[in-house]
């Protein structure tokens, strides 16, 4: 455990005034795993003045950080960069004269308690006033800052000229793009203090490059990948006071591909599982031994999971017999193209025949199958396949 502190497997506390700590507590190698620490409580540590960039990074599981009645004067901008689990920060009664929102902008904080610090009235802390104004009243704190006359002024009354929230405006064409094509987005930002402009492209796969000049920026996305359909692209303006963003959603159109088609599996029903990608949503058509398969309540397409432009589903068969053995082909089609894949399905051997030694026998489908016009949509069709042997349907579960 760090000197002058006590530890448990999930907690570090340094509360005794003497001798106190002069630096943020760090665990000794081969002691408690810092990743398991969820709470650090520091109190009465007058000689603790700084949190450095790398002081807190090892505590990736940290949720609660309390430093109260201590000497904290400075927190490095990147101090909490690796602490994405932080939810509660309490820096009550320290020596902080300034604190930037850059410390906390990447965190999803429930509490940031800063009362009793000698903040200097400046644009640097205007973000705290903005934060207070957006919070519901029970959560507000009595924050003060010292003005030029060294008088305590409530933060709620703070007025700083040329110190306001920025704005971002995105000029985007219709962001529906065909796979492989390119697009350029333009953005303009404004505000005082002058904001910086940056693009938040998330986990965009497509190659992209940006150019920024003062208050104007452009983002060029080239050879657009179908993997980027549905992703959000944001232009962000940020200054001392806060940030503003304007966003667009990218829609990528592309020809269908059947990425997965497997032999049938038996659960509650028999299922020929498949995965299809495509945008716009592809229409699906099944073929049995080369002929169109008409779907019915006994055999039909079910889409179980839709993930943007990817569809996971089954050709579901209710109690298939040896007459349903054969080759099944799935065709997926939209205005950009089509794809098809085939699998062979064997549900059961012919009664009284050893299928392994004598596979040559006629097989037939149910007579009332229908074809779909689109995913998940089944309609009755008249082009039924003539059968040589109609399956006994008397034992079906309805």
């Amino acid at each position: 455990c760090p000197t002058s502190c006590k530890c448990s497997s999930a907690r570090i506390w340094c509360t005794e005034p003497s001798p106190g700590i002069v630096a943020f507590p760090r665990l000794e190698p081969n002691s408690v795993d810092p990743e398991n620490i969820t709470e650090i409580l520091i109190a009465n540590q007058k000689r603790l003045e700084i949190i450095n960039e790398d002081d807190v990074e090892a505590y990736v599981g940290l949720r609660n950080l309390t430093i109260v009645d201590s000497g904290l004067k400075f927190v490095a901008y990147k101090a909490f960069l690796k602490n994405s689990n932080l939810r509660h920060i309490n820096f009550t009664r320290n020596k902080l004269t300034s604190l930037s929102r850059r410390h906390f902008r990447h965190l999803d904080l429930s509490d940031l308690i800063l009362t009793g610090n000698p903040f200097t009235c400046s644009c640097d802390i205007m973000w705290l006033k903005t934060l207070q104004e957006t919070k519901s009243s029970p959560d507000t704190q009595d924050l003060y800052c010292l003005n030029e006359s060294s008088k305590n002024m409530p933060l709620a009354n703070l007025q700083i000229p040329n110190c306001g929230l920025p704005s971002a405006r995105l000029a985007a064409p219709n962001l529906t793009v065909e796979e492989g094509k390119s697009v350029t987005l333009s953005c303009s930002v404004g505000g005082d203090p002058l904001p910086t402009l940056y693009w938040d492209v998330g986990n965009l796969v497509s190659k992209h490059m940006n150019e920024t000049s003062h208050t104007q920026g452009s983002l060029r996305i080239t050879n657009i990948s179908s993997d980027d359909s549905g992703k959000q692209i944001s232009c962000v303006a940020e200054n001392l006071v806060g940030e503003d963003q304007d966003s667009v959603n990218l829609t990528v159109h592309f020809a269908p591909t059947i990425t997965f088609l497997e032999s049938p599996t038996s659960d509650h029903h028999w299922c020929i599982p498949f995965t299809v990608r495509g945008n716009p949503k592809p229409a699906l058509q099944w073929f049995y031994n080369g002929a169109i398969l008409n779907e019915s309540k006994y055999i039909c397409t079910k889409i179980h999971v839709t993930n943007h432009t990817e569809y996971h589903g089954c050709l579901q068969l209710d109690n298939p017999t040896h007459m349903n053995n054969g080759d099944y082909t799935l065709m997926a089609k939209n205005e950009y193209g089509k794809d098809e894949r085939q699998i062979s399905a064997h549900f059961m051997g012919r009664p009284g025949v050893d299928y392994e030694t004598n596979p040559n026998y006629p097989e037939v489908l149910y007579e009332d199958w229908t074809t779909p016009t689109d995913i998940g949509d089944t309609t009755n069709k008249s082009n039924e396949i003539p059968s040589t042997d109609v399956a006994d349907q008397s034992n079906r579960e309805h």
């Epitope: 006590k6 005034p17 003497s18 007058k46």
Partner: antibody, heavy 116, light 106 residues
Framework: EVQLVQSGAEVKKPGESLKISCKGS????????IGWVRQMPGKGLEWMGI????????RYSPSFQGQVTISADKSISTAYLQWSSLKASDTAMYYC?????????WGQGTLVTVSS | QSVLTQPPSVSVSPGQTASITCSGN??????VSWYHQRPGQSPVLVIY???KRPSGIPERFSGSNSGNTATLTISGTQAMDEGDYYC?????????FGTGTKVTVL
């Protein structure tokens, strides 16, 4: 050499005020807490409170809150313990001590006698 | 405010080991210091942060702290070790001393 030198013994009447002192030397006075401890005749040690001379942050034992005032003048490296109205029960030896991993240095003590 | 309870007295023969206990709620979660006071003198710190010895304190003094009990152990007790011993801890926002133990070397 670290030293805490306390003011001399005091004899007072009930109702009178008193301020005793503790002067630190040989170390950075503003960087260590100073504590005050009472020991009544024939009794044990009782913690009264502490002060951090660097910013005059003060903590009191619940038993002594409102009964005494602890202060410090960092310009002359001196901590104080004062009463606005003494009682006979305040008769005791009063120690100041430097906080640094326990109280590692103690003053010689100031004997306060309150009697009518 | 927590209460720290010590035995009123402990007797020990010279050269033997004396153990003084200090009991308090969840004391192991806090640091404990120990002081030795001879009659008419100021207290002297003998153990801090549960088991650390200040410079100048003999090795025969050792400390431990877990659960609800802290212990000061004096091994090879000498006549000069006689006197009152007090434990002390920080509890929430104030220090508290134990009730004190008088050690007699027989």
């Amino acid at each position: 050499e670290v030293q805490l030198v306390q003011s001399g013994a005091e004899v007072k009447k009930p109702g009178e005020s008193l301020k005793i002192s503790c002067k630190g030397s040989g170390y950075s006075f503003t960087s260590y807490w100073i504590g005050w401890v009472r020991q009544m005749p024939g009794k044990g040690l009782e913690w009264m409170g502490i002060i951090y001379p660097g910013d005059s942050d003060t903590r009191y034992s619940p038993s002594f809150q409102g009964q005494v005032t602890i202060s410090a003048d960092k310009s002359i490296s001196t901590a104080y313990l004062q009463w606005s109205s003494l009682k006979a029960s305040d008769t005791a030896m009063y120690y100041c001590a430097r906080g640094s991993g326990g109280y590692d240095y103690w003053g010689q003590g100031t004997l306060v006698t309150v009697s009518s | 405010q927590s209460v720290l309870t010590q035995p009123p007295s402990v007797s020990v023969s010279p050269g033997q080991t004396a153990s003084i206990t200090c009991s308090g709620n969840k004391l192991g979660d806090k640091f404990v210091s120990w002081y030795h006071q001879r009659p008419g003198q100021s207290p002297v710190l003998v153990i801090y942060e549960d088991n650390k010895r200040p410079s100048g304190i003999p090795e025969r003094f050792s400390g431990s702290n877990s659960g609800n009990t802290a212990t000061l152990t004096i091994s090879g007790t000498q006549a000069m070790d006689e006197g009152d011993y007090y434990c002390q801890t920080w509890d929430v926002s104030s220090y508290v001393f134990g009730t004190g133990t008088k050690v007699t070397v027989l």
